[in-house]
Interface confidence: medium
């Protein structure tokens, strides 16, 4: 708490200016207006104050606002956003989505703070839904943000919505998040061509169930290896050497790489190894020939 | 990538002026602060002041006021240190930084030196 | 002036050692504490600022803590370029202040 006292004679603060940066702590608090402060917090920025002088102008702010800061005053915060406890945010309501870019703005390039994740779950809560435009500023900001969403939380994003990803917001998905995305970006890529929407849909396979991958297989779409690796190994157990082959197309000869790696290990221990010959790769570890493969799982089914 | 580029060596003569360049390259040189800190040889660092360069807005240690003023060129992406009534006390390496980023004394310029000498 | 001391001047290391370097500040500086790192002819370098924030880029075997008037910067894993003088620093309030440096050299 910074103790009360006078103002000085003639130091009452008329406008935020760079006068109030040689402004000792306790003349800050005794000199300066909050409601003065409210209305001018966007000079705050321009002016070189000290940390330990921005907590003088927060303290003014929190007994200005105690039930939280309007969205004038906080679209206009600056780097005193860095000051902000995730208990100040949760009194706030932040429904502008500029707003939200302003603040991003001030913790950009750092990762994401106590601070910066609880304002952007406070404005995904107010606007019921991640939309589009939400999404966009909050990938460009965090690559890495809607795998930081847990799959409950991804449920609520809109299909329109995944136009917004790029392939890189992706790379730390799990998936359990891609068996959630994927339905939606199928959805949302439904009325592309071929190419076009296996260029869309790659990212997502992750989350693909096998006859997709079956349907895939029959549309000439060169799947790289890389994408292969990261598909569910329940969904690539079931396809057959074939249904590969048209998968992967020339991509195919990079299965001898990763023969020791999953799925492609799994899957070759499901193949019958005449059939895994007929790759001309040297795959091994298949079914000889002559053994009877049960079905396990469709017996499990029907019992 | 965020570069301070200092201006080079300097031999003066007491009771004489001297001004240190610091240019900065690799972002919006205007949105965030630049320190001045200062370093005698065999001693520690001392933070002279900071200049917002946006504003022009500046800030001294008390120590070094009537001694350093601090300015800046928006249009060179430069910020200037000029030492006046120089003594021997003064000689030193004056380092110029960035708070970029609005992380404290984030990147440092290479140095200058400075040698007060009859 | 808030004065920062660093107690160790010298500290004797190994490859491969867990080393903490201490700064002790003469009143509370509400975690506003960074560290630098400075090897001989070079400028100094911000690893660590609000006491526990790593810089961009700066290897995760460094971390910073504490709170109130004492704070520690934290080599997880010696490395031989770790090898440098170290500074911690107060931001929180001018005239910023810096310790006078500990200096890490091999056993």
């Known amino acids: 708490e910074v103790e009360k006292t006078a103002c000085p004679s003639g130091k009452k603060a008329r406008e935020i200016d760079e006068s109030l940066i040689f402004y000792k702590k306790w003349e800050l608090e005794a000199c300066v207006d909050a409601a003065l402060l409210a209305t001018q917090m966007d000079r705050v920025n321009a002016i070189p104050f000290t940390y330990e002088q921005l907590d003088v102008l927060k303290h003014k702010l929190d007994e200005l606002y105690p039930q939280g800061y309007p969205e004038s005053v906080i679209q206009h915060l600056g780097y005193l956003f860095l000051k902000m406890s995730p208990e100040d945010i949760r009194k706030w309501n932040v429904t502008s989505l500029e707003t939200l870019k302003a603040l991003l703005e001030v913790n950009k390039g750092h990762e994401m703070s106590p601070q910066v994740a609880t304002l952007i779950d406070r404005f995904v809560k107010g606007r019921g839904q991640l939309d589009k435009d939400t999404l966009d500023t909050l990938t460009a900001f965090y690559p890495g943000y809607l795998c930081s969403l847990s799959p409950e939380e991804l449920s609520s994003v809109p299909p329109s919505s995944i136009w917004a990803v790029r392939p890189q917001d992706l790379d730390t998905c799990d998936p359990r998040q891609l068996d959630v995305l994927y339905p939606k970006a199928r959805l949302a890529f439904q009325n592309m061509n071929g190419s076009e929407y296996f260029v869309k849909i790659q990212s997502f396979l992750g989350g693909a169930p096998t006859e997709d991958l079956k349907a895939l297989s029959q549309q000439n779409v060169s799947m790289d290896l890389a994408t292969f690796m990261k598909l569910r190994t329940d969904a690539v157990l079931p396809l057959t050497v074939a249904e590969v082959q048209k998968l992967l197309g020339p991509h195919v000869e990079g299965l001898k790489a990763e023969e020791r790696h999953r799925p492609v290990r799994d899957w070759i221990l499901r193949q019958r190894q005449d059939d895994l010959d007929t790759l001309g790769l040297g795959l091994q570890g298949g079914i000889p020939n002559g053994y009877l493969v049960l079905d396990l799982s469709m017996q499990e089914a029907l019992s | 990538q965020v570069q301070l580029q200092q201006s080079g060596a300097e031999l003066v003569r007491p009771g004489t002026s001297v001004k240190v360049s610091c240019k900065a390259s690799?972002?919006?040189?205007?949105?965030?602060?630049i320190e001045w800190v200062k370093q005698r040889p065999g001693q520690g660092l001392e933070w002279i002041g900071v200049?917002?360069?946006?504003?022009?807005?500046?800030k001294y240690n008390e120590k070094f006021k009537g001694k350093a003023t601090l300015t800046a060129d928006k249009s060179s992406s430069t910020a200037y240190m000029q030492l006046s009534s120089l003594t021997s006390e003064d000689s030193a390496v004056y380092f110029c930084?960035?708070?970029?980023?609005?992380?404290?004394?984030?990147?440092w310029g290479q140095g200058t030196l400075v040698t007060v000498s009859a | 002036d808030i004065v920062m001391t660093q107690s160790h001047k010298f500290m004797s290391t190994s490859v491969g050692d867990r080393v903490s370097i201490t700064c002790k500040a003469s009143?509370?500086?509400?975690?506003?504490v960074a560290w630098y790192q400075r090897k001989p002819g070079q400028s100094p370098k911000l690893l660590i600022y609000?006491?526990?924030t790593r810089h961009t880029g700066v290897p995760d075997r460094f971390t910073g803590s504490g709170s109130g008037t004492d704070y520690t910067l934290t080599i997880s894993y010696m490395q031989a370029e770790d090898l440098a003088l170290y500074y911690c620093?107060?931001?929180?309030?001018?005239?910023?202040?810096f310790g006078g440096g500990t200096k890490l050299e091999i056993k």
């Open positions: 930084a960035s708070d970029y980023d609005y992380d404290p004394f984030a990147y």
């Open positions: 690799g972002y919006a040189f205007t949105n965030y602060l």
């Open positions: 200049i917002n360069p946006g504003s022009g807005g500046t």
């Open positions: 009143q509370d500086v509400s975690t506003a």
């Open positions: 609000w006491a526990s």
């Open positions: 620093q107060q931001h929180y309030s001018t005239p910023y202040t």
